[in-house]
Interface confidence: low
Amino acid sequence: GKSLSHLPLHSNKEDGYDGVTSTDNMRNGLVSSEVHNEDGRNGDVSQFPYVEFTGRDSVTCPTCQGTGRIPRGQENQLVALIPYSDQRLRPRRTKLYVMASVFVCLLLSGLAVFFLFPRSIEVKYIGVKSAYVSYDAEKRTIYLNITNTLNITNNNYYSVEVENITAQVQFSKTVIGKARLNNITNIGPLDMKQIDYTVPTVIAEEMSYMYDFCTLLSIKVHNIVLMMQVTVTTAYFGHSEQISQERYQYVDCGRNTTYQLAQSEYLNVLQPQQ
């Protein structure tokens, strides 16, 4: 077809283009005729007629005003019509540089996305570590200090800050204890930390009937079922995330107990260490 690009007429020997023979010119859509030495300048560029190839036949260069020659004095004002197939339009090194640059940019972008893409922070409630009990016989009140254990796993390739842990303990749908820990720790890339937190709880007032259950030795097992709720707030890149866990646990309200941490995801009957 007629798809041709416009370039300044004078040739450039860079980019591996070294001048053309008449055969080369034929290939490049340029036809040379005999040189005319009107002004004695051998090879004057104005002596070349310019012809456009359409594929089947040729058309005289429209900028030559039908003469087949470039008018004197206009050598630097006119343009040549050069086909897209001209090698000067395909400088190999520049193409390589552009491709390499694009590849490097894509690679760096991919790596940045891979390493900086936010991954999940995993919070696993391990269980009750210990429960220390005391009683107020007059008030028929039980005080339980329950220490729980959490595993927090950072799946990111950058550090994550554990801003705070809020916890509460429920007995029979009533909140009997709350705790909040602030500015806890940083967790390194792909690291895991075990965190213990203690929730002081009070079983009193409308639940004072539990005083008998927990203190009477005529009751063989003093296990009570408590619901442990914990929310961990983490921060990275100025973004905060909250992860919550809930678990029912048996706790012995009859004596001070240290538990073997159970890994099961389900309700655990925790037996004291012997």
Partner: antibody, heavy 118, light 113 residues
Framework: EVQLQQSGPVLVKPGPPVKISCKAS????????IHWVKLSHGKSLEWIGL????????DYNQKFKGKATLTVDTSSSTAYMELNSLTSEDSAVYYC???????????WGQGTTVTVSS | DIVMTQSPSSLSVSAGEKVTMSCKSS????????????LAWYQQKPGQPPKLLIY???TRESGVPDRFTGSGSGTDFTLTISNVQAEDLAVYYC?????????FGAGTKLELK
């Protein structure tokens, strides 16, 4: 080695009380319940009650309330049982035994024979 | 109180035989909280204190030969002694370990034929 060393046999007249002891060794006394069990001739074992040395709490079989009094001395790791208003029905071998938490008594004393005779 | 009923009251066996004794409780000894049966078996030889053989209905106490096996759940329990030895001749008691007062069966006396 876990041991529960009981006091020797006693022969008493009906009426006045008698106190028998059970000295513990080889384990942390305050971590265990101390039980007392009666074995009468020709009868089965009967649970009298228990004491928790950690805080001195006691619990009795209703049948033995008023008959037996259980105490401990943690400084000497010794448990005591006092039997009062003795009659011939109280003649038996009395054992102390220990349990941890909600487990079955695993170690027993060698027994103290109490004979009530006029 | 939980009543423990043992049967038979006595058993005559020859050495090497397998024996089974039964224990029934008036209430379930299964703790619904931890699905554990609170029943123990004791062996008592003349002039000696009772010796714990089995707890939790089926768990053998350390040092107890594996010819002693406990089984059962709820209210019906069994103690099996395979390959009876002369030293096994004794009175065997089952015990409610579920709730106070602790109660014992009347015992099964194992005798030689």
């Amino acid at each position: 080695e876990v041991q529960l060393q009981q006091s020797g046999p006693v022969l008493v007249k009906p009426g006045p009380p008698v106190k028998i002891s059970c000295k513990a060794s080889g384990f942390t006394f305050t971590d265990y319940y101390i039980h007392w069990v009666k074995l009468s001739h020709g009868k089965s074992l009967e649970w009298i009650g228990l004491v928790y040395p950690y805080n001195g709490d006691t619990d009795y079989n209703q049948k033995f309330k008023g008959k037996a009094t259980l105490t401990v001395d943690t400084s000497s790791s010794t448990a005591y049982m006092e039997l009062n208003s003795l009659t011939s029905e109280d003649s038996a071998v009395y054992y102390c035994a220990r349990t941890y938490y909600a487990n079955s008594p695993d170690y027993w004393g060698q027994g103290t024979t109490v004979t009530v005779s006029s | 109180d939980i009543v423990m009923t043992q049967s038979p009251s006595s058993l005559s066996v020859s050495a090497g035989e397998k024996v089974t004794m039964s224990c029934k409780s008036s209430q379930s000894l299964l703790n619904s909280g931890n699905q554990r049966n609170y029943l123990a078996w004791y062996q008592q030889k003349p002039g000696q204190p009772p010796k714990l053989l089995i707890y939790g209905a089926s768990t053998r106490e350390s040092g107890v030969p594996d010819r002693f096996t406990g089984s059962g759940s709820g209210t019906d329990f069994t103690l099996t002694i395979s390959n009876v030895q002369a030293e096994d001749l004794a009175v065997y008691y089952c015990q409610n370990d579920h709730s106070y007062p602790l109660t014992f069966g009347a015992g099964t006396k194992l005798e030689l034929k």
